[in-house]
């Protein structure tokens, strides 16, 4: 019978044993930075090469007894999860192991840095196909470890790491907090976050997705044919490293940004019970469980987008928060969110030649988040058009006036502490879809993009009486690029995209005593690329 | 050669006290620093430390990913190290764990 975890990552229409061919991932090399490993275990023999790299601290304690099978336990199991012949995800992937963790599973930031440098030098000396680096370890937040991961990622290497097993915000740990790294949390057979003793999987905005990480059957270092069940975010990360190897083997030219977008796109959505997470982390934590794509030849025709949350701005009056897209992603829209509702909106602005999303806190606010919608849009030329506050009763409007440019997102930002209630008489005049509309006291920012074959449409869902949540989703074949609220009044906490759905949150009506005048509309901008669709048809 | 005007190198350490490894530091140099400059900066630190009666040991010189070096030294020398040319920041070593 197939282990639950392999079943879970297999697309519904396939059997796991058919779907995971013995040569899956064969064009990819996976580096594992972990404990020593038993590379002649039947599950992994011939699949894993032990490099001569070793940089580990001495074991703690005077009476520590170094038992080989214990020393090898963690690394052997993970190598088996990635590429094991019976219980591995990418059975054809070849692996190289570096020892950076001692027999107690402990290493150092410096040893890990030297290991990453070793990989970079190996890559320069003997360039091979796509490289995946699996970092099934975590320490406290480290600027230098994150920087090294960033450099390696920019050299074309895909890094996958464990979110951490501390039942805490993954942003407090490294390399989990490095934006360039694919950070993986752990779920169980019931798609629930994994509990590990009194702790459990980390969570939060620094997690990219979750993957199976409880009771995972894999190679045991107790004997050359033994298996054992292990749990943790390391096991979850190993699944994603295996999935990445499969995807890169099918499409070796994929960039890190493309791979991350595909991992998110093909994940199972909204299956995790968010009640397990602390309340303030639920909105920030992706409800995604990794899965293999339904076919081995890519999905190049798709317009892929993901949501990136900023760090919390902090509560000071002028505090701002910035959300950034990856270097080869386009920022197509920007929104903001505040639990207290006290915010001054958001704007897209250029920073270092790239657009970023900046959200503004308001006086008395507990802080804001900026939420960027980051998309893969080849040959895109995007710009921001701004209209200052109109002060007129009609509200502020801005549209994309350049030929061939389409509206992908609307943002609004205001200097006043509290926007009065305001309901524009006409939300959007017919025949003007390329237009953003907002409060008369707000500046409105339109994200306007030109890209081959890009078409977008506006979809609205308004509710007459205020509700805590209003949503609107894009239909099949369309991708959500923009999500905003109309009007931008004070009882609106903010707007954000969850997968292909635009969510607008308002304050609890019972506590605010709002009137029915303050209707809330969720505005989604849905786009698709005819160019990408045609290109993929030509390839097939 | 003094550090560039107006840029102050910063010191970082792990927020989780039990995971700190004082006595070992990663000295990260500015992005375009060459290997020879890294080695020179490391030697300069050793020489200046020796003049103050401190022993230091260069454990590794980084190049390929980040320019810099790993040094075993007393925390008393941090102020001195932060003033070295080309230094961007210094981070105290810390533990990582299998997850």
């Amino acid at each position: 019978s197939i282990p639950w975890n392999l079943e879970r990552i297999t697309p519904p229409r396939y059997r796991a044993d058919e779907y995971q061919p013995p040569d899956g991932g064969s064009l990819v090399e996976v580096y594992l930075l972990d404990t020593s490993i038993q590379s002649d275990h039947r599950e992994i023999e011939g699949r894993v090469m032990v490099t001569d790299f070793e940089n580990v601290p001495e074991e703690d304690g005077t009476r520590f007894h170094r038992q080989a099978s214990k020393c090898d336990s963690h690394g052997t199991h993970l190598a088996g999860v990635v590429s094991g012949r019976d219980a591995g995800v990418a059975k054809g992937a070849s692996m190289r192991s570096l020892r950076v963790l001692n027999c107690q599973g402990k290493g150092t930031v410096s040893g890990t840095l030297i290991g990453l440098e070793f990989i970079r030098k190996s890559q320069l000396v003997q360039p091979v196909g796509p490289l995946v680096v699996l970092l099934p370890l975590a320490g406290g937040y480290s600027r230098v470890l994150n920087a090294a991961c960033q450099r390696l990622a920019r050299a074309g290497v895909v890094l996958v790491t464990a979110a951490g097993n501390f039942r805490d915000d993954a942003c407090l740990y490294s390399p989990a907090s490095a934006p360039e790294v694919i950070t993986v949390g752990a779920t169980n057979a019931q798609d629930q976050p994994v509990t590990l003793g009194t702790l459990g999987t980390n969570f939060g905005r620094c997690v990219d997705l979750f993957a199976p990480g409880e009771d995972i059957i894999g190679a045991s270092s107790d004997c050359s044919t033994c298996f054992v069940s292990q749990s943790g975010t390391s096991q979850a990360a190993a699944h994603v490293a295996g999935i990445a190897a499969m995807m890169l083997s099918a499409e070796p030219e994929l960039t890190l940004a493309e791979l991350r977008q595909r991992l998110i796109h093909f994940s199972a959505k909204d299956v995790i019970n968010e009640a397990w997470f602390p309340e303030d982390q639920r909105v920030l934590t992706p409800n995604l469980v990794a899965a293999l794509p339904p076919s081995t030849h890519g999905a190049g025709w798709q317009l892929f987008c993901r949501t990136v949350w900023s760090a919390h701005s902090g509560p000071t009056r002028m505090a701002t928060a910035i959300a950034r897209c990856a270097p080869d992603e386009e920022l197509l829209s920007c929104s903001s969110f505040s639990r207290s509702g006290k915010r001054r909106g958001e704007r897209m602005e250029a920073q270092g030649g790239k657009l970023v999303c900046r959200a503004h806190n308001a006086f008395g606010g507990e802080g804001v988040y900026a939420i960027a919608r980051c998309c893969l849009l080849p040959q895109a030329n995007c710009s921001v058009h701004t209209a200052p506050p109109a002060e007129a009763s009609m509200g502020t409007r801005v549209h994309c006036h350049q030929q061939g440019h389409v509206l992908t997102g609307c943002s609004s930002h205001w200097e006043v502490e509290d926007l009065g209630t305001h309901k524009p008489p006409v939300l959007r005049p017919r025949g003007q879809p390329n237009q953003c509309v907002g409060h008369r006291e707000a500046s409105i920012h339109a994200s306007c993009c030109h890209a081959p074959g890009l078409e977008c449409k506006v979809k609205e869902h308004g509710i007459p009486a205020p509700q805590e949540q209003v949503t609107v989703a894009c239909e099949e074949g369309w991708t959500l690029t923009g999500c905003s609220a109309l009007p931008g009044t004070s009882h609106v906490l903010g707007a954000y995209a969850v997968d292909n759905t635009c969510v607008v949150r308002s304050r609890d009506v019972s506590t605010t005593g709002s009137t029915s005048e303050e209707a809330v509309t969720a505005v989604a901008i849905c786009c698709r690329s005819r160019h990408l669709a045609q290109a993929s048809q030509e390839l097939q | 050669e003094a550090p560039e005007h107006g840029t102050t190198a910063t010191f970082h350490r792990c927020a989780k006290d039990p995971w700190r490894l004082p006595g070992t530091y990663v000295v990260v140099l500015k992005e375009e620093t060459h290997l020879s400059q890294s080695e020179r900066t490391a030697r300069r630190l050793q020489a200046q430390a020796a003049r103050r009666g401190y022993l230091t040991k260069i454990l590794h010189v980084f190049h390929g990913l980040l320019p810099g070096f790993l040094v075993k030294m007393s925390g008393d020398l941090l102020e001195l190290a932060l003033k070295l040319p080309h230094v961007d920041y210094i981070e105290e070593d810390s533990s990582v764990f299998a997850q």
Partner: antibody, heavy 115, light 107 residues
């Protein structure tokens, strides 16, 4: 290139012991164990067991019934298979092969048990 | 232990012929089946692993197929150097077990 070179032919009396060696080269020995397979005259192939260069762990076929011992000496990249209390039906060609996958084989060592 | 049964136990064929040898396992072995070629006085040589994968250096005229319990080795166009004994071996469980062999002789 991968090579497994075995020791020469042996003639033994019933009840005696034999120790066959297999020297590995051309690959990283710790990444693979060594399997031992025998073939009686005119017969098929029979797997006897496996031994690790990495930690000396073994995995024996039940049929050996404690008569066989497999060892390795990583310093010389050599694996050994010792068979005790030899019987006439142990007469066979003994092969070593790389790992459980048995993708490369030694040339074989003929062991003849005869009174 | 898993029993492996090969058929036929021997066959006569001419150069250029297409030859098929079958192997049946006593229980499902997924795709964990290897094929070996052995010439008189020589060690076996791995021809096919995991039912259908050819190691580098093995001519493309050799191909393997099947999964579960039934497997086939096909030689698309028999060459003079292909006259030998062929063994299947299951790699699913320990101990690995071999078929009794199929001897391919010149007609």
């Amino acid at each position: 290139q991968v090579q497994l070179v075995q020791s020469g032919a042996e003639v033994k009396k019933p009840g005696a012991s034999v120790k066959v060696s297999c020297k590995a080269s051309g690959y990283a020995i710790y990444n693979y164990g060594i399997s031992w397979v025998r073939q009686a005259p005119g017969q098929g192939l029979e797997w006897m067991g496996w031994v690790s260069f990495y930690n000396g762990n073994t995995n024996y076929a039940q049929k050996l019934q404690g008569r066989g011992t497999m060892t390795t000496d990583p310093s010389t990249s050599t694996a050994y298979m010792e068979l005790r209390s030899l019987r006439s039906d142990d007469t066979a060609v003994y092969y070593c092969a790389r790992g459980y996958v048995m993708d490369f084989w030694g040339q074989g060592t003929t062991v003849t048990v005869s009174s | 232990d898993i029993q492996m049964t090969q058929s036929p136990s021997s066959l006569s064929a001419s150069v250029g012929d297409r030859v098929t040898i079958t192997c049946r396992a006593s229980q499902s072995i997924n795709n964990w089946l290897d094929w070996y070629q052995q010439k008189p006085g020589k060690a076996p040589k791995l021809l096919i692993y995991a039912a259908s994968t050819r190691p580098s250096g093995v001519p493309s005229r050799f191909s393997g197929s099947g999964s579960g319990t039934d497997f086939t080795l096909t030689i698309s166009s028999l060459q003079p150097e292909d006259f030998a004994t062929y063994y299947c071996q299951q790699d699913q469980d320990i101990p690995p077990t071999f078929g009794q062999g199929t001897k391919v002789e010149i007609k």
